[in-house]
């Protein structure tokens, strides 16, 4: 199709060297009074068009995105080409930064519903480079947390290092979802509520003597409980003795709930006694059988091929530990009678 | 009893100013509310004017027209709303309700009965 | 600011009819909308949050539907006691929780 008649938005993505980060384009499809093209751009004032401009309708996940290759090939399409980029509804998610993601890239509804729809589309200029060393050094991080039940904030990165008063209106979305009372470099969560948590988009426009474009950038917002104040507490092994039989095998398995830690760096391993010996036992690795905001359980199990006697003199012990401390607990094994 | 009261009424003149106060009683206003003011004019609808916040960081929202004549404020310590009403003219005429705004519904669970506000010269 | 378009404007109706009453959010409040009641020379009274949620002690013939920016208030069966006048309200402001602009109100009167 021609893209000559496409509205054109030229963004700009700063991407950190340091910093895993994301980047999203949105289908911003213009909107029936805002429109200098699709249906006003082909309507003398007193005709009235036959469907619906495209936006009138609320479903915009119905949109397909192709990119324009630099030297003048045909349009390729998003999905087939390009795995490290994913649609979804009208958003275009590039997972990974990198200069190669520089390009045009159009969007247009899938369902061409009537003949003034064919110029319903837009192409959007991206320029995508590293982040300068020049630039500033504390800049806002591209992933942010938010503590549950107080008052928190989300800065936009790549203005965090201005004041208030010297910042470019910004334009806000959450979830892809504009806010449009948001318009400082900062938004001011009053109290945190898991609602806050998701995706948060900031643009501002920057300008020289020749043209403008949107500088945007992508913040993951986590909200969070605070940082646990006890140590692990081990759920199981709960008694300190098992029964078993000889030459048979056995797992033992240790499961330990850990806190919340925001630098989260649980240990849980298994070593022998015995008598004034100890040592680790290599183990299988451990796994997160469950995890929930405020905690989580760990298991981490150890194997017997088969019980031996001498197995039954010594005491396995189960160690569990997170940035407050440690707790074990031990465990003797007894030979099943009967 | 929770409960919230609105006082400072007055008939002002245009071009005039006028201070409301909304003691509340029954709960703390360092809990996690939005304080707000709500206005009705004679024979008409409700209109929001303004909410601050009542936890720490104290933010405040406007309507857009009131921005600029019309201050919240509040002082936790006497569990009070303040609305600082400047330039009145004679549209600000209305019954100024006090109202509390909870939680992560944010809507209006507590009203007082209302202050009348009359500009006129 | 959010605009919230209620109508009708006023609506006449006879105990025990089907009263329906619709709000339109300027932009997308997702469900961070209420409903009151208000009856002449009194405070407004709180009848649905969240766009569906009955307050506590309202009768269950008043219903609330809708989400993004299109809500209805339903009163499956008018009693005496309900001829007032309604307001939806937008309850998210950007990404706190504020209340804020109302609907201009819809006056229900006897037949």
């Known amino acids: 199709f021609n893209i000559s008649g496409c509205s054109t938005k030229k963004l700009l993505w700063t991407y950190s060297t340091r910093s895993e980060e994301e980047f999203v384009l949105f289908c911003d499809l213009p909107e029936p009074q805002k429109s200098h093209f699709c249906h006003r751009n082909r309507l003398s004032p007193k005709q009235v068009p036959e469907h619906l401009p495209f936006m009138g309708s609320n479903d915009l996940s119905d949109v397909q995105w192709y990119q324009q290759p630099s030297n003048g090939d045909p349009l390729e399409d998003i999905r087939k080409s390009y795995p490290h980029i994913i649609q979804d509804k009208c958003t275009l998610h590039f997972l990974t930064p990198g200069v190669n993601n520089s390009g045009s890239y159009i969007c247009r509804p899938k369902m061409i519903k009537s003949p003034y729809d064919v110029a319903c589309c837009v192409k959007m200029i991206l320029e995508v480079k590293p982040q300068t060393n020049a630039s500033c050094e504390y800049s806002a991080s591209h992933k942010q947390d938010l503590l549950l039940g107080s008052t928190g904030s989300i800065s936009c990165p790549s203005l965090s290092c201005q004041s208030d008063a010297q910042s470019p209106a910004v334009t806000w979305y959450k979830n892809g979802k504009l806010l449009s009372v948001e318009r400082s470099n900062r938004i001011v969560v009053d109290e945190v509520y898991d609602y806050h948590q998701g995706t948060y988009v900031c643009d501002y426009t920057q300008s020289d003597t020749v043209s403008s474009w949107t500088v945007r950038a992508v913040v993951q917002v986590r909200t969070i409980v605070g940082d646990t104040k006890l140590k692990p507490d081990i759920l199981d092994p709960v008694e300190d003795t098992l029964e078993v039989e000889l030459g048979k095998p056995l797992t033992i398995s240790c499961k330990a709930r850990f806190g919340f830690e925001r630098v989260f760096n649980p240990v849980i391993k298994w070593y022998i006694k015995d008598s004034d010996l100890e040592w680790e036992v290599s183990v299988p690795e451990a796994k997160s059988i469950k995890s929930t905001l405020k905690d989580e359980i760990i298991e981490r199990n150890i194997i017997l091929e088969k019980v031996t006697q001498r197995d039954l003199r010594r005491k396995f012990v189960c160690f569990v530990q997170n940035s407050i401390g440690n707790t074990t607990q031990s465990v003797q094994l007894k030979e099943k009678r009967g | 009893e929770v409960q919230l009261e609105e006082s400072g009424g007055d008939l002002v003149q245009p071009g005039g100013s006028l201070r409301l106060s909304c003691a509340a009683s029954g709960f703390s206003f360092s809990s996690s509310y939005y304080m707000c003011w709500v206005r009705q004019a004679p024979g008409k609808g409700l209109e929001w004017v303004a909410c601050i916040y009542a936890g720490s960081s104290g933010s405040t929202y406007y309507a857009s027209w009131a921005k600029g004549r019309f201050t919240i404020s509040r002082d936790n310590s006497k569990n009070t709303l303040y609305l600082q009403m400047n330039s009145l003219r004679a549209e600000d005429t209305a019954v100024y309700f006090c109202?509390?705004?909870?939680?992560?519904?944010?809507?209006?669970?507590?009203w007082g009965q209302g202050t009348l506000v009359t500009v006129s010269s | 600011d959010i605009q919230m378009t209620q109508s009708p404007s006023s609506l006449s109706a006879s105990v025990g009819d089907r009263v329906t009453i619709t709000c339109q959010a300027s932009?997308?409040?997702?469900?961070?909308l209420a409903w009151y009641q208000q009856k002449p020379g009194q405070a407004p009274k709180l009848l649905i949050y969240r766009a569906s949620t009955l307050a506590s002690g309202v009768p269950s013939r008043f219903s609330g539907s809708g989400s993004g920016t299109d809500f209805t208030l339903t009163i499956s069966s008018l009693q005496p006691e309900d001829f007032a006048t309604y307001y939806c309200q937008s309850t998210i402001y950007g990404v706190n929780f504020v209340p804020n602009a109302f609907g201009g109100g819809t006056k229900v009167v006897i037949k």
């Open positions: 932009e997308d409040i997702e469900s961070y």
């Open positions: 109202a509390r705004g909870a939680g992560s519904n944010g809507d209006f669970n507590l």
